[in-house]
Interface confidence: medium
Amino acid sequence: DTEIKVNPPQDFEIVDPGYLGYLYLQWQPPLSLDHFKECTVEYELKYRNIGSETWKTIITKNLHYKDGFDLNKGIEAKIHTLLPWQCTNGSEVQSSWAETTYWISPQGIPETKVQDMDCVYYNWQYLLCSWKPGIGVLLDTNYNLFYWYEGLDHALQCVDYIKADGQNIGCRFPYLEASDYKDFYICVNGSSENKPIRSSYFTFQLQNIVKPLPPVYLTFTRESSCEIKLKWSIPLGPIPARCFDYEIEIREDDTTLVTATVENETYTLKTTNETRQLCFVVRSKVNIYCSDDGIWSEWSDKQCWEGEDLSKKTLLR
């Protein structure tokens, strides 16, 4: 479109600061920018994990960018220089691409890495991760877990391992201050005298793996001759009421099973005077207003009514 030319950025590289997947992409300005002293050049950066179908694209005036990646796979990135239109009379001037890649050289065969990694953030308070040892690894193999999230100066190692047969098979995390609503990075690596062990990397956000406690204080209140209100209280802990969804299971006279999902701590049930027995249980889950995903709590203790008391105003266990 134009004779004006601009070089790509120099020294484009991906730097691993040791944060288990949170990487720095950095570069230097292109050579020969003297003609464009009055211009702030921009850079279009594209990057992805190798094998991903989609690139992430950003445009920045800075000489660095940070983002999270899956270190189980390689990373590829490319960048080019853009001259603002103001500097080129509206012509579109961009450099060729500078490209770079990064990957961690894998040690050991894939089967040696931990299997069935499972992390649960109990009641939005206690994080616990568990795993199974790799396939065919010997008992001398031990696994170590490291974690990092934005706010920590460096990656930390688990200090409270769960063990089985002398092997680490899980980690109880300490209190994790200001750790939700941001990427939480984990690496589980291992050592064995006999063979190298493959590392595994995991990334999630804590609010999406919360398993709350079950609801408590289940009660019945007769609203009218044909309506009974079921009520319960939110479980103890830091999760606010606005963050819960509930699932109710109701059994009437050992025959009818009603299940319902509700957002409040009440449910009104249509019933008849012939009802002899009514039981219900409730479980809770963090809702879409507070997380993208979650784990259902265990069911609450069962609350039942039997006999004539159902016609009375309030029924408590």
């Epitope: 479109d1 279009e44 989609t54 694209t57 445009i59 853009l82 239109w85 579109e92």
Partner: antibody, heavy 119, light 107 residues
Framework: QVQLVQSGAEVAKPGASVKVSCKAS????????TQWIRQAPGQGLEGIGA????????SYNQKFKGRATLTADKSTSTVYMQLSSLRSEDTAVYYC????????????WGQGTLVTVSS | DIQMTQSPSSLSTSVGDRVTITCKAS??????VAWYQQKPGKSPKLLIY???YRYTGVPSRFSGSGSGTDFTLTISSLQPEDFATYSC?????????FGQGTKLEIK
């Protein structure tokens, strides 16, 4: 000079899909983003998404994610926009346009393709 | 997405008049605003980019100003060929979003 030539008008039934093409010439096809923008009768312009033919990178307006699919054929310097599950509100003129990047205005536009959704 | 609100939606005016069209962004977009002219049955034509820079070949009677959230397109002396619809666009963040357009009609 830069030219974007789009395919002809289309009539489609609700629930069907339509594929509009945009053939580029006069520049290095793989080095620039091609945007798709639509304009319903009497309405303003609305961005659908963009594709970078150099590596098939795409960027979709959230409103059209899952319904619009952008593809590029390097051998013919043509970009395609397919819109599925059509409804009457999708009746519009669909434009392809070229900017240097995702965040540049569009000095070059196709002539537009009228898509009419009607049962 | 950033909303672009344009006013007025239509304007009856005469050749030789000075015309001002405004565009308000729902959040700060620095100076990343473009203006387009569109005539019936035709594609939009880029007039102004980066709030105040005239695109190649655009007559000097067209000028743009503003930064942050408030932007203005001014036509200093309206010519017969300027009767058209004018739209603003933010090119600050993805997806690009446009104003609803201002139609200039002959009084």
């Amino acid at each position: 000079q830069v030219q974007l030539v789009q395919s002809g008008a289309e009539v489609a039934k609700p629930g069907a899909s339509v594929k509009v093409s945009c053939k580029a010439s006069g520049y290095t096809f793989t080095s620039y983003w091609t945007q798709w923008i639509r304009q319903a009768p009497g309405q303003g312009l609305e961005g659908i998404g963009a594709i970078y033919p150099g590596d098939d990178d795409t960027s979709y307006n959230q409103k059209f994610k899952g319904r619009a699919t952008l593809t590029a054929d390097k051998s013919t310097s043509t970009v395609y926009m397919q819109l599925s599950s059509l409804r009457s509100e999708d009746t519009a003129v669909y434009y392809c346009a070229r900017g240097a990047t995702l965040l540049r205005p569009f000095p070059y536009w196709g002539q537009g393709t009228l898509v009419t959704v009607s049962s | 997405d950033i909303q672009m609100t344009q006013s007025p939606s239509s304007l009856s005016t005469s050749v030789g008049d000075r015309v001002t069209i405004t565009c308000k962004a729902s959040q700060d977009v620095s100076t990343a605003v473009a203006w387009y002219q569109q005539k019936p049955g035709k594609s939009p034509k880029l007039l102004i980019y980066s709030a105040s820079y005239r695109y190649t070949g655009v007559p000097s009677r067209f000028s743009g100003s503003g930064s942050g959230t408030d932007f203005t397109l001014t036509i200093s002396s309206l010519q017969p060929e300027d009767f058209a619809t004018y739209s603003c666009q933010q090119h600050y963040s993805i997806p690009p979003t446009f104003g609803q357009g201002t139609k200039l009609e002959i009084k």
